[in-house]
Amino acid sequence: IINGSDCDMHTQPWQAALLLRPNQLYCGAVLVHPQWLLTAAHCRKKVFRVRLGHYSLSPVYESGQQMFQGVKSIPHPGYSHPGHSNDLMLIKLNRRIRPTKDVRPINVSSHCPSAGTKCLVSGWGTTKSPQVHFPKVLQCLNISVLSQKRCEDAYPRQIDDTMFCAGDKAGRDSCQGDSGGPVVCNGSLQGLVSWGDYPCARPNRPGVYTNLCKFTKWIQETIQANS
């Protein structure tokens, strides 16, 4: 997250970290059910671990943390590497979470976002770009949903209805390492960090997010079929 600020503790209990061994964070994810996460399809790895209820980036033990294995990862069948359409994936955890103030699911919004909606994006991704500098704790940033026209103008021929753009002033954006993490609008999960320009936070080059309102049926049906 570029030019965000430290999230208040316990305010993002759905935020998950996807880790490669030993404890390398490579993507964010979102708890949407007691045993299921959503993340970006481009975050798929065969071997990874899931950390929930953790505030700092470092692997130091925190009393609220819960660790999991992913037993199933189900990318949206319409995703096409290295493209960006349909960039979402469900991960089934090896057990249900223990709900606490630090670990709690969030509902996926069935309403599509309108321009001007205020949202919050969070993650442990780099706080500088193109340099790489990772934060000590989870970062939060207020962003506004842009109109689809502004989105398409920013990225001609690259935007479809499975994506939306959001941003703020130049210099504020999500970035590498935030992928798969949540965009929360009006208390519901509206999007996932998907892609954007490089370096991040360039003028007139907003972040692009998976438009989850288009996938509520797929999410529900996939969880039901695999539970």
Epitope: K45, K46, V47, S80, H81, P82, N94
Partner: antibody
């Protein structure tokens, strides 16, 4: 050097159990999923199953109930057991490492197991 | 079922030819497809993963493309060392799968 080496008896009697081990060197089993694949003489590749560092195991549907895959991370080896074998289980058996992006990037040389009385 | 069907099962070609092998999945596997080359008496070798990413050390004449259900491996200019059997493998799911591999395509000298 990253290496995989399968070993086990080359001949197994019908109705017996085929047991193979795959010795792993040059990388930690805790970081990778491992696969077993077989190839009957003159035929194509057949996936048998995968084992993950967490000891979660996926088996091919034909292998469920007959196959057991396990690992010993301290001994850095992966094992395959196939019970109630018939002549149709005669094949070259390979172990392989997944590159974490769903491609098998390191393979053992394979070991031929013949099922015959 | 996620069955993988390769075609053709065999083909004859000459050095320098452009060769195309196809792999079709019975359901969408997104981009989780790998290609392997196998020579007689040897273990398979990974060529391409994620449908189009070249594995380390693989010559650039090998190219993978496709997504969803239809995938292609193209060898732009066949070299003598490319005569071998090629297999595709889906990595989308392991649930209730008989085989993740396609049946293979043997590339022979014309």
């Amino acid at each position: 050097e990253v290496q995989l080496q399968e070993s086990g008896p080359g001949l197994v009697k019908p109705s017996g159990t085929l047991s193979l081990t795959c010795a792993v060197s040059g990388f930690p089993l805790s970081n990778y999923a491992m696969s077993w694949v077989r190839q009957p003489p003159g035929k194509g590749l057949e996936w048998i199953g995968d084992i993950y560092p967490s000891d979660i195991i996926d088996y091919a549907s034909w292998a469920k109930g007959r196959v057991t895959i396990s690992q010993d991370k301290s001994k850095t080896q992966v094992s395959l057991k196939l019970s109630s074998v018939t002549a149709a289980d005669t094949a070259v058996y390979y172990c392989a490492r997944d590159n974490n992006d769903y491609g098998l990037d390191i393979w053992g040389q394979g070991t031929l197991v013949t099922v015959s009385s | 079922a996620y069955d993988m069907t390769q075609s053709p099962s065999s083909l004859s070609a000459s050095v320098g030819d452009r060769v195309t092998i196809t792999c079709q999945a019975s359901q969408s596997i997104s981009s989780w497809l790998a290609w392997y080359q196998q020579k007689p008496g040897k273990a398979p070798k990974l060529l391409i993963y994620l449908a189009s990413t070249l594995a380390s050390g693989v010559p650039s004449r090998f190219k993978g493309s496709g997504s969803g259900t239809d995938f292609t491996l193209t060898i732009s200019s066949l070299q003598p060392e490319d005569f071998a059997t090629y297999y595709c493998q889906q990595g989308y799911t392991n649930s209730n799968i008989i085989n993740t591999f396609g049946g293979g395509t043997k590339v022979e000298i014309k």
